[in-house]
């Protein structure tokens, strides 16, 4: 599921990093959780996993 | 079905270490992390802190740093909890617990599951 | 670290009664994402705690329709429209948009 894996450790907002699937895009923040979003459809999702879905 | 196993009650001596687990299932351990939450008798409950176990990555509360080493096992879906140097204000028990949100649309969800508990008692 | 500061200590109610939990916390829960990051948990003696509702108004899977969350600020509460037996326990609210994660004190809810 993790296609992509961007570090944001330099990044003064809270997420460690993030990660894009097919199905979802997660983040993980540094409070201790994930929040991710999922697609019900191709709508919104990026031009890369459009393709690859 | 999201379980999270706990191992079985502790009794220690004062100044002895102990190591509490806790095995999941239902869910991938790798897309959650997993929290440990102090609770001692008749009391509030208390973050220990939480384990990152895509990466190992680990953030403690202040008062816990020197007290608590956590660890995971993704391939025995297994986190552990190690508590050194025991006195009796560790007297507790300890919870780990999955956290995680998110949103399918306007379907929302939550991750947030908590195991049985291990019950620790530090005896002099 | 974030006080989140729980009324009353004890809330004895008659079953049917509506009951009400108050937190409040020492800042803003806003979280830089847009969510506010309030949870309420029951705890039933001799078991660990369970999730009753999520990001200050959302119920948790499973959880009866009269409980429901609310916010006014740094203000947050908990309702139960109608109290039934198996409510009765210790109600904790908790936060984490914060390091450290922190939880109220608990309001125990018993029969009056």
């Known amino acids: 599921d993790q296609w992509s894996t961007q570090d944001l450790y330099n990044n003064p907002v809270t997420a460690v990093f993030n990660y894009q699937g097919l199905w979802r895009s997660c983040v993980r923040e540094s409070s201790g959780f994930t929040e991710c979003r999922g697609y019900f459809t191709l709508l919104g999702l990026p031009a890369m996993l459009q393709a690859v879905r | 079905e999201v379980q999270l196993q706990q191992s079985g009650t502790e009794l220690v001596r004062s100044g002895a270490s102990v190591k509490l687990s806790c095995t999941t299932s239902?869910?991938?351990?790798?897309?959650?992390?997993l929290h440990w939450v102090k609770q001692r008798p008749e009391q509030g409950l208390e973050w220990i802190g939480w384990?990152?176990?895509?990466?190992?990555?680990?953030k403690y509360a202040p008062k816990f740093q020197d007290k608590v080493t956590m660890t995971v096992d993704t391939s025995s879906n297994t986190a552990c909890l190690h508590l050194s140097s025991l006195t009796s204000d560790d007297t507790a028990v300890y919870y780990c617990?999955?956290?995680?949100?998110?949103?399918?649309?306007?379907?929302?969800?939550?991750?947030?599951?908590w195991g049985q508990g291990t019950s620790v008692t530090v005896s002099s | 670290d974030v006080v989140m500061t729980q009324t009353p200590l004890s809330l004895p109610v008659s079953l049917g009664d509506q009951a009400s939990i108050s937190c409040r916390s020492s800042?803003?829960?806003?979280?830089?994402?847009?969510?506010?990051?309030l949870h309420w948990y029951l705890q039933k003696p001799g078991q660990s705690p369970k999730l009753l509702i999520y990001?200050?108004?959302n119920r948790f899977s499973g959880v009866p329709d009269r409980f429901s969350g609310s916010e006014s600020g740094t203000d947050f509460t908990l309702k139960i429209s109608r109290v039934e037996a198996e409510d009765l326990g210790i109600y904790f609210c908790?936060?984490?948009?914060?390091?450290?994660?922190?939880f109220g004190g608990g309001t125990k809810l018993e029969i009056r």
């Open positions: 800042q803003s829960l806003v979280h830089s994402n847009g969510n506010t990051y």
């Open positions: 239902g869910f991938n351990i790798k897309d959650y992390f």
């Open positions: 908790s936060q984490n948009t914060h390091v450290p994660r922190t």
């Open positions: 990001k200050v108004s």
């Open positions: 384990i990152d176990p895509e990466n190992g990555d680990t």
């Open positions: 617990n999955v956290l995680g949100y998110g949103n399918y649309g306007h379907f929302y969800y939550a991750m947030d599951y």
